[in-house]
């Protein structure tokens, strides 16, 4: 990796694009801290591990983030 | 439709300063990481320096270290680029461009967007 | 600090042939980092690729990209007569945080 977490912040660019969670690999939501001062949301695809950073004021973005707590919360007994 | 159009170069002596601007159009300007990029006079083309989308993380050429900032103001859609201390070498086209979407700092997109370019003379 | 090698410096073909433009990194380089651009006389840069071998949107399928570690190739299967152009590998790395190559200029054989 080029640059380490020292950088603050992750996102260069974030995509308002919904995601399919059934390509989604994995869904980081980084909380604000003192390397960052916004959420970070960083979704990695199954096609070729693409890592994407999406908006977290976007819409689809909130509508992807309650469809995966809800399959989540399917699968957790 | 998507644009960015660069302005402000001109010629200008060694030592003295200028500063460049870039006006995004058609597109969300405050959620893209923006780059500036240069190209010399029949020369291949060398990056500048970076910026993301909240203006959190900038990143500079060593050949600009110190010399150059770049900044943004997304409320009026526009990327700059202060340069001072300029030598006969950073004469060249400047363009400015868009970083794609979603990048990061683990997957990069590409620069998917350019300006036209504008020039920048250094000559006493 | 990552030098990128492009060659041929040039490559001389004629419509309809293929075209393999080559760029070779001094250290390895993820592909999740390496792009490639076109540039025309007068022209700004245009992304063709990124991660690669993803195509960049609108770009034809004619274009593609391929490898990985050191050894990255830019192929065009059938040269357009708009295709003739300059070719530029990026990477992006430390120090510089991105990397241009040399460029291969693809002309008219």
């Known amino acids: 990796i080029p640059l380490s977490r020292t950088v603050r912040c992750t996102c260069i660019s974030i995509s308002n694009q919904p995601v399919n969670p059934r390509s989604l690999e994995k869904l980081e939501i980084i909380p604000p801290s003192q390397f960052c001062p916004h959420v970070e949301i960083i979704a990695t695809m199954k096609k070729k591990g693409e890592k994407r950073c999406l908006n977290p004021e976007s819409k689809a973005i909130k509508n992807l983030l309650k469809a995966v707590s809800k399959e989540r919360s399917k699968r957790s007994p | 439709q998507v644009q960015l159009v660069e302005s402000g170069g001109g010629v200008v002596q060694p030592g003295r300063s200028l500063r460049l601007s870039c006006t995004a159009s058609?597109?969300?300007?405050?959620?893209?990481?923006m780059h500036w990029v240069r190209q010399a006079p029949g020369k291949g083309l060398e990056w500048v320096a970076v910026?993301?989308?909240?203006?959190?993380?900038?990143y500079y050429a060593d050949s600009v270290k110190g010399r150059f900032t770049i900044s943004r103001d997304n409320s009026k859609n526009t990327l700059y680029l202060q340069m001072n201390s300029l030598r006969a070498e950073d004469t060249a086209v400047y363009y400015c461009?868009?970083?794609?979407?979603?990048?990061?700092?683990?997957?990069?997109?590409?620069?998917?967007?350019w300006g036209q370019g504008t020039t920048v003379t250094v000559s006493s | 600090e990552i030098v990128l090698t492009q060659s041929p410096g040039t490559l001389s073909l004629s419509p309809g042939e293929r075209a393999t433009l080559s760029c070779r990194a001094s250290?390895?380089?993820?592909?999740?980092?390496l792009a490639w651009y076109q540039q025309k006389p007068g022209q700004a840069p245009r992304l063709l690729i990124y991660?690669?071998?993803s195509r960049a949107t609108g770009i034809p399928d004619r274009f593609s990209g391929s490898g990985s570690g050191t050894d990255f190739t830019l192929t065009i299967s059938r040269l357009e007569p708009e295709d003739f152009a300059v070719y530029y590998c990026?990477?992006?790395?430390?120090?510089?945080?991105?990397?241009f190559g040399p460029g291969t200029k693809v002309d008219i054989k």
């Open positions: 058609g597109f969300t300007f405050s959620q893209y990481g």
């Open positions: 991660g690669a071998s």
């Open positions: 910026i993301s989308y909240g203006g959190d993380i900038k």
């Open positions: 461009a868009r970083e794609g979407e979603g990048s990061n700092i683990y997957y990069y997109y590409g620069m998917d967007v």
């Open positions: 250290q390895s380089v993820s592909s999740s980092y």
């Open positions: 990026q990477q992006y790395g430390s120090s510089p945080i991105f990397t």
